[in-house]
């Protein structure tokens, strides 16, 4: 018979014949022959192959490097890679999440508009007139200036975007 030019799904062409691919979780040891089947071996510990394949080496599981703010979300198997995610207080640098960075803090004069998540950083906003923030924080919003009037006091020192107003007693009218 004519040697095949194409093979069925889960097969590959080698030496003018169709051999079975190795199943996920296994690597190729030797190609099939006229008389023998494809020989495959399971991937070792901390290795995987996630497709029907003819790879002679399995892939190493991804290392979730704590120095890059990563931790294991899902342990890999012989058929799947390890999935990493960010440590608490860190967020991914891209959609693929190959590394993480610490959430940014909002500087004094800025408040948190949106608290960071595992995939997005802190969003800061400048404190508008009437509000202040005197700390560097990843959680604190801008606080409103103290209302001296409601305490029956007067403003002794005006507030800024970084400082609260200073209240003091009203001057007594002398007789």
């Amino acid at each position: 018979p004519e040697p095949p030019t194409a093979c069925r799904e889960k097969q590959y062409l080698i030496n003018s014949q169709c051999c079975s691919l190795c199943q996920p979780g296994q690597k190729l040891v030797s190609d099939c022959t006229e008389f023998t089947e494809t020989e495959c071996l399971p991937c070792g510990e901390s290795e995987f192959l996630d497709t029907w394949n003819r790879e002679t080496h399995c892939h190493q599981h991804k290392y979730c490097d704590p120095n890059l703010g990563l931790r294991v979300q899902q342990k890999g198997t012989s058929e799947t890679d390890t999935i990493c995610t960010c440590e608490e207080g860190w967020h991914c640098t891209s959609e693929a999440c190959e590394s993480c960075v610490l959430h940014r803090s909002c500087s004094p004069g800025f408040g948190v508009k949106q608290i960071a998540t595992g995939v997005s950083d802190t969003i800061c906003e400048p404190c508008p007139v009437g509000f202040f923030s005197n700390v560097s924080s990843a959680f604190e919003k801008c606080h409103p200036w103290t209302s001296c009037e409601t305490k029956d006091l007067v403003v002794q020192q005006a507030g800024t975007n970084k400082t609260d107003v200073v209240c003091g007693p009203q001057d007594r009218l002398r007789a």
């Epitope: 996630d50 080496h57 892939h59 190493q60 991804k62 120095n67 890059l68 703010g69 890679d81 640098t93 891209s94 959609e95 693929a96 190959e98 590394s99 960075v101 610490l102 959430h103 940014r104 950083d121």
Partner: antibody, heavy 113, light 108 residues
Framework: VKESEGGLFKPTDTLTLTCTVS????????VSWVRQAPGNGLEWIGG???????YYASWAKSRATITRDTNLKTVTLEMTSLTVADTATYFC??????????WGPGTLVTVSS | AFELTQTPSPVSAAVGGTVTIKCQAS??????LAWYQQKPGQPPKVLIV???NLASGVSSRFKGSGSGTEFTLSISDLECADGATYYC??????????FGGGTEVVVK
């Protein structure tokens, strides 16, 4: 990771370089391209993440295209409208938007009329 | 556009001495900074990740510090083999992935 051969190009030519990877899956790790003009510093061109998203330096957005073939285990950089200023050693490195711990040896691209 | 500025270059010191290289970001990148060493004819080698963490197999003579916009790489007990060009790299986001201009370290 290893880059394909560079070579001599003329101004206005299009450069195509291929990075071939082994020992890891492109579904697990991204690949980036970095270049270095003779006697100059490192310049990030762009990269492709493990999810297939491509990212580019602002200067390269209009001229560079990075694609991948997960089955062939290759990542391709195409750069159009070459000028003499594109003469450099081009490196591919494992990783998208991250730290690059594994680099290819680099390949020299010369643009000259 | 986002920039990383490295200073000074070149910097020289005697064997056994200490050198300090600075890297300044044009906007906050938290701790998303790495340091690399590159010798002529070779690709770069990563030394520090996350601004202050030693990469695997790197000598503890290398020390990274800083966060936000100001970062420092210090090399103590200098050896002849430390003569190289050092680069900082931001990886905070795709729009701020960039290398510094490099600092040449000369060991006398």
């Amino acid at each position: 990771v290893k880059e394909s051969e560079g070579g001599l190009f003329k101004p206005t030519d299009t450069l195509t370089l291929t990075c071939t990877v082994s020992g890891f899956s492109l579904s697990s790790y991204g690949v980036s391209w970095v270049r270095q003009a003779p006697g100059n510093g490192l310049e990030w061109i762009g990269g492709i993440g493990s999810d297939g998203s491509a990212y580019y330096a602002s200067w390269a957005k209009s001229r560079a295209t990075i694609t991948r073939d997960t089955n062939l285990k290759t990542v391709t950089l195409e750069m159009t409208s070459l000028t003499v200023a594109d003469t450099a050693t081009y490196f591919c490195a494992r990783g998208g938007i991250t730290v690059y711990a594994i680099w290819g040896p680099g390949t020299l691209v010369t643009v000259s009329s | 556009a986002f920039e990383l500025t490295q200073t000074p270059s070149p910097v020289s010191a005697a064997v056994g001495g200490t050198v300090t290289i600075k890297c300044q970001a044009s906007q906050s990148i938290s701790n998303g900074l790495a340091w690399y060493q590159q010798k002529p004819g070779q690709p770069p080698k990563v030394l520090i990740v996350g601004a202050s963490n030693l990469a695997s197999g790197v000598s503890s003579r290398f020390k990274g510090s800083g966060s936000g916009t100001e970062f420092t790489l210090s090399i103590s007990d200098l050896e002849c083999a430390d003569g190289a060009t050092y680069y900082c790299q931001s990886y905070f986001s795709s729009s701020s992935t960039v290398f510094g201009g490099g600092t040449e370290v000369v060991v006398k």
